[in-house]
């Protein structure tokens, strides 16, 4: 469970993928579409709002903590809409809502190498925010062999 | 466990310029997720904030100082330093540094902060 | 800016009671962003409740926060010994951060 219902603390940032795509949001028929792609130089990178909440949780070796807890975030790129899992469909998904926010919205921070975090799925432990066919998904990552995948590492730059 | 500590000059003349560095030391300062800043609390006063700083360089100020503030970071060191130009009796205090949760506001566009781990504080006095 | 009001500005109480501070804002907050501080003689501030009702890291649970839009309460429900201390609130809601002037919670 989440500690408050208060984030601890919010950063700006760009999301990009380990091969340094980035991930956009356009609005498009009254809701957004979230792409991944090459941008051009001159082309200004969207930012994310990410809030870390506090879990009761201990965090793991690889879980971001604070005070030895773990830490989660939720994502969003413009007001009132949230990065979202859709367990159902493996899909990530933008939504409009009001806080408290549903579980959907909230991915454990993982601290990886180079500079490198990954998004797991609060509600579906293991699954986690990725790339696939130019487009964010949810993928199943099995612990023993994984967790370094490229495919669910993005960088996140100011 | 995270410590910060500062550290400067005690004595200040009127119209010089007040230095003081922030050491943090148990984390380290490029944190994504925090924020650093400084507080003052003059004798016997409430506290007022100064301004805080992100570790890539990103500073937001006070508007009452902002005029005679700077705040800068230098990683390298895991440090944070404050410096407040053409100061007068009034800026008399206790200068506290801290770690700060920083939240956005959509509306304004803009951060605002809490402090969530202090420094012990250094007192700096202006007189000639 | 937004203006935080808090009262009393003393508070007269004997250890084992219930102290119950209150901060009023000028403006009201859409969020819950409200942080409470303790500060004894000589010492830093101490984060006791960020977001209004969060209690920080290490804080025991006699002490409690409440409230929204303008009107924010903290309450420590039974006063210990090492509790009497000067309590300030804070906005972080819109920038400039700003503080209340401080309730004063002493020995009767």
């Known amino acids: 469970s989440i500690t408050g219902i208060s984030p601890i603390t919010e950063s700006l940032a760009s999301l990009s993928t380990y091969n340094d795509q980035s991930i956009t949001f356009a609005l498009e028929d009254e809701s957004y579409e979230i792409y991944v792609e090459d941008l051009k130089k001159d082309k200004k990178k969207d930012k994310v709002l990410l809030s870390y909440y506090e879990s009761q949780h201990p965090s793991s070796e690889s879980g971001d903590g604070v005070d030895g807890k773990m830490l989660m975030v939720t994502l969003s790129p413009t007001k009132d809409f949230w990065l979202q899992a859709n367990n159902k469909e493996h899909s990530v998904e933008l939504h409009k809502c009001e806080k408290p926010l549903p579980d959907q919205a909230f991915f454990v921070l993982h601290n990886r190498s180079f500079n490198c975090v990954s998004f797991e799925c609060k509600t579906d432990p293991g699954v986690f925010i990725g790339v696939k066919d130019n487009h964010l998904a949810l993928i199943k990552v099995d612990y023993s062999e994984n967790l370094g995948s490229e495919n669910i590492l993005f960088k996140l730059s100011e | 466990e995270l410590q910060l500590q500062e550290s400067g000059p005690g004595l200040v003349k009127p119209s010089e310029t007040l230095s003081l560095t922030c050491t943090v030391s148990g984390g380290s300062i490029r944190s994504s997720i925090f924020y650093w800043g400084w507080i003052r609390q003059p004798p016997g006063k409430g506290l007022e904030w100064i301004g805080s700083i992100y570790y890539s360089g990103r500073t937001y100020y006070n508007p009452s100082l902002k005029s005679r503030v700077t705040i800068s970071v230098d990683t390298s060191k895991n440090q944070f330093s404050l410096m407040l130009t053409s100061v007068t009796a009034a800026d008399t205090a206790v200068y506290y540094c801290a770690r700060a949760g920083g939240l956005y506001n959509w509306n304004d566009e803009s951060f605002s902060f809490y402090m969530d781990v202090w420094g012990q504080g250094t007192t700096v006095t202006v007189s000639s | 800016e937004i203006v935080l009001t808090q009262s009393p500005g003393t508070l007269s109480l004997s250890p084992g009671e219930r102290a119950t501070l209150s901060c009023r804002a000028s403006?009201?907050?859409?969020?819950?962003?409200l942080a409470w501080y303790q500060q004894k003689p000589g010492q830093a501030p101490r984060l006791l409740i960020y977001?209004?009702?969060s209690r920080a890291t290490g804080i025991p649970d006699r002490f409690s926060g409440s409230g929204s839009g303008t009107d924010f309460t903290l309450t420590i429900s039974r006063l210990e010994p090492e509790d009497f201390a000067v309590y300030y609130c804070q906005q972080y809601d819109r920038s400039p951060l700003t503080f209340g002037g401080g309730t004063k919670v002493e020995i009767k």
């Open positions: 403006q009201s907050f859409s969020s819950s962003y």
């Open positions: 977001g209004a009702s």
